[in-house]
């Protein structure tokens, strides 16, 4: 379980890397509570006839995707970025958008967003991950360093139809998906419901009625009894794994 790994962090997420490393005193390791088991994601998406959809930022991708280079690491080849399948629970991440809906990037690991831990108005202990140089430390060495900041966080979850930015803004059972030119909370798809599997992503970024992803334990697959002449128009539904 994830209890077997101790996590340290010392970076404010989405900040550029430090120049010459960070300094500070070694931070204490934080044990992370175990989460629910999940399906692992692959290095590349493996849809039939999959054509990568180029992107510049996460918002151009689907709610269960993020924008990054498909090559190893984050460097990329020639700076080309495409929409990649989101990272499941307990996978390595570098920012929140990499994690699948219902998860967030905590100390480099996609963790479930268990909002029961944060009731409305509760004081939350937030870790500020510090990259500042500390001249008392060994010069140039980077050490995990943590500073605690107390802040008041209000967690109000968007109901169906509420405007949202990402799925974590929506209540349980909802995801944040495009509707016309904004994004609203829509229901996560149930077994048997029609889903969208993008074989050609050319119009994906301009999809104005975006469906949610399939719910837990379901995958978007071609409906077995749905045979049509055109491959591109075959119906996909949410089916049990």
């Amino acid at each position: 379980t994830l209890n077997s790994v101790l996590i340290n962090s010392n970076a404010i997420k989405n900040l550029p890397p430090p120049l010459g490393g960070a300094g500070g005193q070694p931070g204490s390791a934080v044990s992370v509570a175990p989460g629910v088991l999940y399906e692992g994601g692959n290095k590349y998406q493996t849809l039939d006839n999959y054509q990568p959809y180029p992107c510049a930022e996460d918002e151009e991708c689907g709610s269960d995707e993020y924008c990054s280079s498909p090559s190893r690491g984050a460097a990329g080849v020639g700076g080309v970025q495409i929409c990649l399948a989101c990272r499941k629970r307990r996978k390595r991440c570098m920012r929140h958008a990499m994690c699948c809906p219902g998860n967030y990037c905590k100390n480099g690991i996609c963790m479930p967003s268990d909002h029961s831990h944060f009731p409305r108005g509760e004081i939350e202990e937030s870790i500020i991950e510090n990259l500042g140089n500390d001249h008392n430390a060994a010069a140039g060495d980077g050490y995990p360093r943590r500073t605690t900041l107390t802040s008041k966080i209000y967690h109000t979850k968007g109901q169906e139809g509420s405007v949202c930015l990402r799925s974590s803004d929506c209540a349980a059972g909802l995801c944040c998906a495009r509707h016309f030119w904004s994004k609203i909370c829509k229901p996560v798809l149930k077994e048997g419901q029609v889903c969208t599997k993008h074989k050609r992503k050319g119009s994906h970024g301009l999809e104005i009625f975006q469906r949610c992803y399939c719910g837990e334990g379901l995958a978007c697959r071609i409906q077995k009894d749905h045979h049509q002449a055109s491959n591109s128009s075959r119906l996909h539904t949410c089916q049990r794994h």
Epitope: T1, L2, S4, V5, I7, N8, S9, N10, A11, K13, P17, P18, G21, A22, L37, E39, G40, G41, N42, K43, Y44, R72, G73, A74, A75, L84, R87, R90, R92, C93, M94, N107, G108, I109, E129, L131, G142, P144
Partner: antibody
């Protein structure tokens, strides 16, 4: 070319600490995790943990709880693994490996640093 | 922790033989599995990632398959330079764990 160069062999007494370095070249150092894996003579591979020099994230396997510290120096593209309170069973070859954080494949390895713990 | 069990622990085969190594996970790990080759006195080398994808520059005689808990690594036609120990590694859950290794020898 893409490579990880590790520091030389070490002989330590029980209770002491050892600090192994791993210098990266030929790739963007901050775009990958660096994992540390050890291998005792004639035995299998044991993952110790990772660190990401860009974010500073580190994760340690619980077997090494409280004994391992992974640090880095971005300016010289080097990561360090320090293991304290050494015991005889820590005698092993310690490898650093470039690790993709998408599929956690360790595709570039250092040659290994032999650490011998003996009184 | 997820336990990875490889079998056999060692095997002897002739040049040109088809060689198969299996790896079993103690729980479902989807396709989150890599295979490595380690020659004596050397560092491991990544051969297969995501259970079945061949790493760049690795000869096509190496292949991998499987998902869930049961995985197979195959060398379609054994070559003298394939003498090594082979390890599977799961990355579905932390900590990362390796199989105990399979030592391959030439008959």
């Amino acid at each position: 070319q893409v490579q990880l160069v590790q520091s030389g062999a070490e002989v330590k007494k029980p209770g002491a600490s050892v600090k192994v370095s791993c210098k990266a070249s030929g790739f963007t150092f901050t775009s990958y995790d660096i994992s540390w894996v050890r291998q005792a003579t004639g035995l299998g591979l044991e993952w110790m943990g990772w660190m990401n020099p860009s974010s500073g994230y580190t994760g340690y396997a619980q077997n090494f709880q409280g004994r391992v510290t992974m640090t880095w120096n971005t300016s010289i593209s080097t990561v360090y693994m320090e293991l304290s309170s050494l015991r005889s069973e820590d005698t092993a070859v310690y490898y650093c490996a470039r690790t993709d954080y998408y599929y956690y494949g360790m595709d570039v390895w250092g040659r290994g640093t032999t650490v011998t713990v003996s009184s | 922790d997820i336990q990875m069990t490889q079998s056999p622990s060692s095997l002897s085969a002739s040049v040109g033989d088809r060689v198969t190594i299996t790896c079993q996970a103690s729980q479902d790990i989807s396709k989150d599995l890599n295979w490595y080759q380690q020659k004596p006195g050397k560092a491991p080398k990544l051969l297969i990632y995501d259970a079945s994808n061949l790493e760049t520059g690795v000869p096509s005689r190496f292949s991998g398959s499987g998902s869930g808990t049961d995985f197979t690594f195959t060398i379609s036609s054994l070559q003298p330079e394939d003498i090594a120990t082979y390890y599977c590694q799961q990355y579905d859950d932390l900590p990362i764990t390796f199989g105990q290794g399979t030592r391959l020898e030439i008959k």
